[in-house]
């Protein structure tokens, strides 16, 4: 079709695709009317001078997954109409200066998954119309000042999965149109104050999986349009009180997998669009009053796998919309009777794997819509009379792995459990720990030498198991029984994600699924 090379396929839509290991050089002659050219999975190792000279109408050029390690500076000469150029997944270590000269229409440049060691201001100085620049998955150790100064129209910049140890506060200063900046999986230890000040249109900032220890108080103060902020899996030990105060558009904030020890009241400044907050895998020891009070629309709050030993009675003030609360795998011994009082719409709460010795009788008093309560693996010996009586929607209650004391005081609980047996699930039932003569026997059928009338077990609503809560990729919750699933790193681009296997798909979330949302 207008001279289609034998190694290629050419469509009537002016699209040419050349693939296969037998290709060792750019095939010729290419159809003069080609608008899209893909050279994929070949053994081409270099691009010489002007291999595309006769296809000046080309709009998109993909040279991906080859053995390409060397490009002559004039390789892309005469491609003034080119809007999309991908050299991803090759073996490029060096980019010649002037390689992109003359590509005046270029909007997307993909250089990801190569072996690039450095970039220089001169590399992109001609690319004034560039909107997207992908440099993730290379070996970049630093970005020189001025590298992006000419890319004033850039809207997406990905520098993830490199070896960056520091960022100059001036490197992004001219990128006023940038909407997405990804710096995940580098070796950044801190971000200088002012680094993001020029990014007034930024909507997504990905800083996860670095080694960031401290955040400057005003780091995000100019980023009023920020919608997604990823800070998970760093070494952040504290949050300056005002760091999140001017992010009214934020709808995603990840802070899990850090070293946070405390959260100050109101730390999460007004964020009316934030619906989920994952804080698992930190070192939080206590929750003060009003710590989440600005998060009026929050639906899911994950605080599992911390070291929380104290929760102030007003810690959850303001969370009127909360549906799911995960507090499992902490160090809680006692809970104030009013701690959940404001959570009128709560449906699921996970408190398993703590050290709870007792619960106040009014702990769930105002939380009438509760569907799932996880209390397994605590230090509970008994529960107050009527603690669950008003919970008409309760369909999953987990009480196993507690040291239940099966004396006559256990009768009210035992009778309630008899009436509500289906809610306990079939996996594991609560068993007596004391006295010694009944240790290991089921709490539900134990004989405590008091006559108990036979009871009819009524139907309870049939709901699926309760929802899961994030816990951690590395530490499965061994008290649950489930099938193997995979955990992965969050917020990546779509290639080469590390996969870690664990043995429980609920370990991270800490609940099964009474509510599915």
């Amino acid at each position: 079709y207008h001279g289609c090379p034998s190694e290629c396929t050419c469509s009537r839509a002016s699209q040419v695709e050349c693939t296969g290991a037998r290709i060792v050089a750019v095939p010729t002659p290419l159809p003069w009317n080609a608008m899209s050219l893909q050279i994929l999975n070949t053994h081409i190792t270099e691009l010489n001078e002007s291999p595309f000279l006769n296809i000046s109408a080309l709009i998109a050029l993909r040279i991906e997954k080859n053995e390409l390690s060397r490009i002559t500076p004039g390789a892309f000469r005469n491609l003034g109409s080119l809007r999309y150029l991908s050299l991803a997944n090759n073996k490029l270590q060096v980019l010649p200066i002037g390689l992109f000269q003359g590509l005046d229409s270029l909007e997307s440049l993909l250089l990801s998954s190569n072996q690039l060691l450095q970039i220089q201001p001169a590399h992109f100085s001609q690319c004034s119309n560039l909107k997207e620049l992908q440099l993730h998955g290379n070996h970049l150790e630093y970005i020189p000042d001025g590298a992006f100064d000419h890319l004033v129209g850039l809207t997406k910049l990905n520098l993830g999965k490199n070896s960056l140890t520091h960022i100059s506060p001036r490197v992004f200063q001219h990128l006023g149109n940038l909407q997405v900046l990804r710096l995940y999986e580098n070796r950044l230890t801190d971000i200088p104050m002012g680094t993001f000040d020029g990014l007034v249109n930024l909507q997504e900032l990905a800083l996860q999986q670095n080694q960031i220890g401290l955040l400057s108080p005003g780091l995000f103060h100019n980023n009023h349009n920020l919608q997604r902020l990823y800070l998970s899996n760093n070494h952040i030990s504290q949050l300056p009180p005002s760091v999140f105060m001017q992010l009214p558009q934020l709808n995603r904030l990840t802070l899990f997998g850090n070293s946070l020890k405390e959260l100050s009241p109101g730390i999460f400044g007004p964020m009316p669009n934030l619906r989920e907050l994952w804080l698992y895998d930190n070192h939080i020891s206590s929750l003060p009053d009003n710590v989440f009070s600005n998060l009026r629309q929050l639906q899911v709050l994950i605080l599992s796998r911390n070291q929380i030993s104290f929760i102030s009675p007003g810690a959850f003030n303001g969370l009127t919309e909360l549906r799911e609360l995960s507090l499992h795998t902490n160090a809680l011994q006692d809970l104030d009777g009013n701690v959940f009082r404001m959570l009128a719409n709560l449906q699921n709460i996970s408190l398993q794997n703590n050290r709870l010795r007792q619960l106040p009788g009014n702990i769930f008093a105002n939380v009438n819509g509760l569907m799932a309560i996880q209390l397994q693996n605590n230090q509970l010996e008994n529960l107050p009379l009527g603690i669950f009586d008003h919970l008409g929607k309760l369909c999953e209650l987990r009480l196993y792995d507690n040291p239940w004391r099966c004396d006559s005081d256990i009768l009210p609980l035992r009778n309630w459990l008899l009436l509500n047996q289906p809610r306990l699930g079939t996996d594991t039932v609560p068993v007596c720990f004391s006295p010694a003569n009944v240790r290991g026997q089921s709490l539900i059928i134990i004989n405590v030498n008091v006559a108990v009338p036979s009871v009819h077990v009524p139907e309870v609503p049939s709901y699926p198991e309760t929802p899961w809560y994030p816990d951690t990729p590395s530490y499965p919750d061994t008290t649950s029984v489930s099938s193997t699933t995979e955990l992965t790193s969050p917020v990546e681009d779509y290639t080469d994600l590390t996969t870690i296997q664990v043995t429980d798909d609920r370990s991270v979330w800490g609940m099964t699924q009474a509510q599915s949302g």
Epitope: R275, Q299, T320, E324, W468, T485, E486, L487, E492, Y494
Partner: antibody, heavy 119, light 110 residues
Framework: EVQLVQSGAEVKKPGSSVKVSCKAS????????IHWVKQAPGQGLEWIGL????????NYNQKFKGKATLTVDTSTTTAYMEMSSLRSEDTAVYYC????????????WGQGTTVTVSS | DIVLTQSPDSLAVSLGERATINCRAS??????????MHWYQQKPGQPPKLLIK???SLESGVPDRFSGSGSGTDFTLTISSLQAEDVAVYYC????????FGGGTKVEIK
Amino acid sequence: EVQLVQSGAEVKKPGSSVKVSCKASGFTFTDYYIHWVKQAPGQGLEWIGLVHPYIGGTNYNQKFKGKATLTVDTSTTTAYMEMSSLRSEDTAVYYCARGDNKYDAMDYWGQGTTVTVSS
Amino acid sequence: DIVLTQSPDSLAVSLGERATINCRASQSVSTSSYSYMHWYQQKPGQPPKLLIKYASSLESGVPDRFSGSGSGTDFTLTISSLQAEDVAVYYCEQSWEIRTFGGGTKVEIK
């Protein structure tokens, strides 16, 4: 551009299994929930369950527990739904869809995969 | 499970006229801030398309002739001026508990 591209139509014998795939592109796969929805011929929509690709955690509609298994492969940004012990009433179009937060609406849908169970 | 009942089952409206579809839930799906009710449009041979989320929030890219209202158990989808391309089946969905859909309302041109 956000896209969910599903695998092609399947014809299966009763008692067998089928695995439908949903390839995601144009968004950060590990940051969204993936839902699965059934639509039997001439019928309405029925929610099967969801999976969160970051941890592989799942929620199921009780009706489909034991029938459907939801998994993901983050390396290929693909979600899967496997249906086992197929019966004629499993004949339907199955959709995958994306949700930003757990309780949010499903804002992007795959084109659907028709599964026909017939002896 | 929460049952969603849509009415009418089908609706014939003249071009340019208003179309109103109702959805009643068997229990409240609202809080003081949110109603966990969403609306979808499905054309023959196509997947559903999100129109309205959280009862009244118009999805990006959806024409503003579509609007949603209601709270508690009663919700309404309104097409202010029916266009030919609006011929479809419309579904409500709740995400308060286990997600369920209404039975659908078929909208045709009179």
